[in-house]
Interface confidence: low
């Protein structure tokens, strides 16, 4: 039977979801085994005009020392105002100074990037050392890149579309996802449910994705569920501020004993099938509906607190 | 610095038409949620309509007092912000208020003044 | 729609006193936030986030409240303080905001 809740965008203070994910719009992993110098590239798209972003760079030592160099070269189509966490990593970056301002000095070797098209700058980048991993990105706000961590079977990096990065390459979008909500027809009470759908990702191997969820309600006040659906392959570690009904494909454990992973449910992978879901556990309102791209980490800031929700 | 400025307002008749202009400056507009906000003369403040940023699909909200009348509409390569108005009311005389929204709303216009009377 | 009701819709005070305006909302919210608005002028932000002042707000101002019930208080009023104060929420649709306190020298 069809459920009648017209799914509506919540006002911003009611929900608010971020996400951490190794999905690009375009990317490559590769191996680079006996190269001196690790080649990174990334292009990044901010369709906003100047903006500022975090970058971290992240050694994985080998036998106790950072074995080779690392070239990062970063191409961007406007301003940026950059905050770059290197520590200890003998990096080089070849970057263009009239787009890229520090937040403060890099303390790193510095190149100036030709203003190439985005294929000779994979070139330029090549010739200076294999290229491990290259990524296009769309208005990120902070980049987690891990160097010597690279598991790609590929020799050669090439520009692919949808990929997934893997531990290679994390990052948080500016934009936070849409949060929707809604009454669920003809049921009583005060039962709340949170619904997160994580889609299928571009690569299918085993998956933890870490999720916070913050309610600022009262203990005492809440009645809710939380509702995770995923892929088969997703299992999840939840870290919430309150104790709820939880509900999921896969396992799950919790933060607090993360070796207990318990044994999800079989869900239904469709936002009515979801809905019909909380409306099977009683709930009379969705509080928070998101559908999210494959993450590592998804936050929830919800203070709906039970029945209170408004929608357009 | 941040500036918004309304254009646009003037008298008309009821039932005519009026569009209204912000033209915006000093930060991303493309990125901002925008709303505007209108004060009958001697009333306080009421919320006319939002659009959201691209990454946001554009999407709309109107007023129930409103919708179906007004059209909140933007041009992010001019950076500007439209609200046409249509079947305008004698109730509808304020002065409009072009609004950024950033978890509230920390930038105003000036305001233009709309006056519907015949 | 939640309904935003302030009290008092004015109030009459001296510089140095103590003023407090109140913000109740038909259903409970988030945040509150409020405006400041002078005769002729457009409004500006003054409180959000229930009790944070945004930039350039003197200190004598505050915020505070949650639920239902929100409070402006200006603990000492100064001559440049007398003007109109709005709250508004955005915790459900459509946003509102409270009919506004006229704050007057006595």
């Known amino acids: 039977e069809t459920v009648h809740c017209d799914l509506q965008p919540v006002g911003p203070e009611r929900g608010e979801v971020t996400y951490t994910t190794s999905q690009v719009s375009k990317g490559c992993v590769a191996q680079a085994p006996n190269a001196i110098l690790e080649v990174h590239v990334l292009f990044l798209e901010f369709p906003t005009g100047p903006s500022q972003l975090e970058l971290t760079l992240q050694a994985s030592k080998q036998n106790g020392t950072w074995p080779r160099e690392v070239l990062l070269v970063l191409s961007v189509n406007s301003s940026v105002f950059l905050h770059l966490q290197a520590l200890g990593i003998p990096l080089h970056l070849a970057y263009n100074s009239s787009l890229v301002t520090f937040q403060e000095p890099p303390g790193v070797n510095t190149t100036e990037l030709p203003s190439f098209p985005k294929t000779q700058i994979l070139e330029w980048a090549a010739e200076r050392g294999p290229i491990t991993s290259a990524a296009e990105l769309n208005d990120p706000q902070s980049i987690l890149l891990r160097l010597g961590q690279a598991q790609g079977s590929l020799s050669f990096c090439m520009l692919e579309a949808s990929q997934d990065m893997g531990r290679t390459l994390e990052w948080r979008p500016r934009t936070p996802a849409l949060v929707r909500g809604c009454h669920l027809e003809g049921v009583a009470g005060h039962k709340e449910a949170h619904i997160l759908r994580v889609l299928p990702g571009h690569s299918a191997g085993p998956r933890t994705v870490t999720v916070k969820v913050e309610l600022s309600c009262a203990p005492g006040d809440l009645d809710a569920v939380l509702i995770l659906q995923g892929p088969p392959y997703v299992s999840w570690l939840i870290d919430a501020n309150h104790n709820m009904q939880i509900w999921t494909t896969g396992e799950y454990s919790f933060k607090i004993f993360p070796e207990k992973n318990i044994r999800g449910f079989k869900l239904p992978d469709t936002p009515q099938g979801l809905l019909g879901e909380a409306r099977m556990l009683n709930a009379s309102i969705v509080a928070s509906f998101v559908e999210l791209p494959l993450a590592s980490i998804v936050s929830l800031h919800a203070s709906s607190c039970g029945g209170r929700l408004q929608t357009s | 610095e941040v500036q918004l400025v309304e254009s646009g307002g003037g008298l008309v008749k009821p039932g005519g038409s009026l569009r209204l202009s912000c033209a915006a400056s000093?930060?991303?507009?493309?990125?901002?949620?925008m709303d505007w906000v209108r004060q009958a003369p001697g009333k306080g403040l009421e919320w006319v309509a939002e659009?959201?940023?691209?990454?946001?699909?554009?999407?709309?909200y109107y007023a129930e007092s409103v919708k179906g009348r007004f059209t909140i509409s933007r041009d992010d390569s001019k950076n500007t912000l439209y609200l046409q108005m249509n079947s305008l009311k004698t109730e509808d005389t304020a002065v409009y208020y072009c609004?950024?929204?950033?978890?509230?709303?920390?930038?105003w216009g000036q305001g233009t003044l709309v006056t519907v009377s015949s | 729609d939640i309904q935003l009701t302030q009290s008092p819709s004015s109030l009459s005070a001296s510089v140095g006193d103590r003023a407090t305006i109140t913000c109740r909302a038909s259903?409970?919210?988030?945040?509150m936030h409020w405006y400041q608005q002078k005769p002729g002028k457009a409004p500006k932000p003054w409180i959000y986030?229930?009790?944070n002042l945004a930039s350039g707000v003197p200190s004598r101002f505050s915020g505070s409240g949650s639920g239902t019930d929100y409070t402006l208080t200006i603990s000492s009023l100064q001559p440049e303080d007398f003007a109109t104060y709005y709250c508004q929420q955005w915790s459900s649709n459509p946003l509102t905001f409270g009919g506004g306190t006229k704050v007057e020298i006595k």
């Open positions: 986030a229930s009790s």
């Open positions: 609004t950024r929204w950033r978890r509230f709303f920390d930038s």
């Open positions: 659009i959201r940023s691209k990454a946001s699909n554009h999407a709309t």
């Open positions: 000093g930060f991303t507009f493309s990125d901002a949620w």
């Open positions: 259903s409970s919210v988030s945040y």
